[in-house]
């Protein structure tokens, strides 16, 4: 509600901000507090008590004085008063200081992302022209989560050297379209890297990786746990041999046997033969009988 | 940590023009903007004129309106503030302080006097 224009007490005309302006009623804010010091003071704002109506009759004064959008200066030093911002106030800002994120999404820590934060991290990103590691190191600390927050199309803007920066947790609500377009940037990123280090930093990202490359990684003796190998592609283990998946998982393979009947194990184990499942000696059952014929209807389907 | 330096103060005779130069150094995007205060003797500090950290707001006490105006750059990590103070009146004689959150400069003396 617009707050009635009435004219400032003698005497009570705002000289600065400070707390004596806490004791101000909502009218003698608007009448007796000058908008333009109010921005050039906004570093003062957090450290007053001040009510969330006070709080709105201050943004009611910030908005007056700029109806095209906050400029940062001020946008840095909203404090409590970003929580009292729209999605519509946020779009119209030009946010480009990552100090300036920090400071907001600091504002707003431990709560679930809301739709101003989410804009924000819009507006910031869309500036910005990508998702460059020191954002994707904040957002993440700030929201574990970020990462999987994230289309596939609005991931494909992440350049592979932001990938240092994500960590296993940020990866742990990401699906297998979302791995899709990681992983090859993981690849890339971690691409110098040697054997067992190339593994630890690849691990997370395997969800969106090729069968080939599951296959390269099975002669590399890398010991893959079972909650990794269970995230994999349904798609890209069932080429994979029994042997293959025996070097993959190494001392880990006895895992199967307790997830036989979930994927990927029970559709891969339907495409080994039975004979190559008991070398595992795992007791694991459902392969393709002895004697039987492996026709590969995809091969079929491709040559007519 | 903001290190604020100020300068430019001096003796001018009533009418004259001077102009203060307020030097902030350290975190000072930790600021949303800086501050001239006026601490003549005996009484209490005046806020005379601030300015957004981004120049794009400024404001002034009712007794320097029109007659002084603050800008501000930045140079080599640093931000500049200046107050240019034209029509000086022998009341405007004061220490002239420059401040930032819980910064202060130490001061520079400006007297109007014939």
């Known amino acids: 509600r617009e707050v009635e224009k009435t004219a400032c007490p003698s005497g009570k005309k705002a000289r600065e901000i400070d707390e004596s302006l806490i004791f101000y009623k909502k009218w003698e804010l608007e009448a007796c507090v000058d908008a333009a010091l109010l921005a050039t003071q906004m570093d003062r704002v957090n450290a007053i008590p001040f009510t969330y109506e006070q709080l709105d009759v201050l943004k009611h004064k910030l908005d007056e004085l700029y109806p095209q959008g906050y400029p940062e200066s001020v946008i840095q030093h909203l404090g409590y008063l970003f929580l009292k911002m729209s999605p519509e106030d946020i779009r119209k800002w030009n946010v480009t200081s990552l100090e300036t994120l920090k400071a907001l999404l600091e504002v707003n820590k431990g709560h679930e992302m809301s739709p101003q934060v989410a804009t924000l991290i819009d507006r910031f990103v869309k500036g910005r022209g990508q998702l460059d590691k020191d954002t994707l190191d904040t957002l993440t600390a700030f929201y574990p989560g970020y990462l999987c927050s994230l289309s596939p199309e609005e991931l494909s803007s992440v350049p592979p050297s932001s990938i240092w920066a994500v960590r296993p947790q940020d990866l742990d609500t990401c699906d297998p379209r979302q791995l899709d377009v990681l992983y090859p940037k993981a690849r890339l990123a971690f691409q110098n890297m040697n054997g067992s280090e190339y593994f630890v930093k690849i691990q997370s990202f395997l969800g969106g990786a090729p069968t080939e490359d599951l296959k390269a990684l099975s002669q590399q003796n890398v010991s893959m746990d079972l909650a990794t190998f269970m995230k994999l592609r349904t798609d890209a283990v069932l080429p994979l041999t029994v042997a293959e998946v025996q070097k993959l998982l190494g001392p880990h393979v006895e895992g199967l046997k307790a997830e036989e009947r979930h994927r990927p194990v029970r559709d891969w184990i339907l495409r080994q033969r039975q004979d190559d499942l008991d070398t595992l000696g795992l007791g694991l059952q459902g392969g393709i009988p002895n004697g039987y014929l492996v026709l590969d209807l995809s091969m079929q389907e491709a040559l007519s | 940590q903001v290190k604020l330096e100020e300068s430019g103060g001096g003796l001018v005779q009533p009418g004259g023009s001077l102009r203060l130069s307020c030097t902030a150094s350290?975190?000072?995007?930790?600021?949303?903007?800086l501050t001239w205060y006026r601490q003549r003797p005996g009484n209490e500090r005046e806020l005379v004129a601030s300015i957004t950290t981004g120049g794009e707001t400024t404001w002034y006490a009712d007794s320097v309106k029109g007659r002084f105006t603050i800008s501000i750059s930045r140079d080599n990590g640093k931000m500049i503030t200046y107050l240019q103070m034209n029509s000086l009146k022998p009341e405007d004689t004061a220490v002239y302080l420059c401040n930032s959150r819980s910064y202060w400069g130490q001061g520079t003396q400006v007297t109007v006097s014939s």
């Open positions: 350290g975190s000072i995007w930790s600021a949303s903007g």
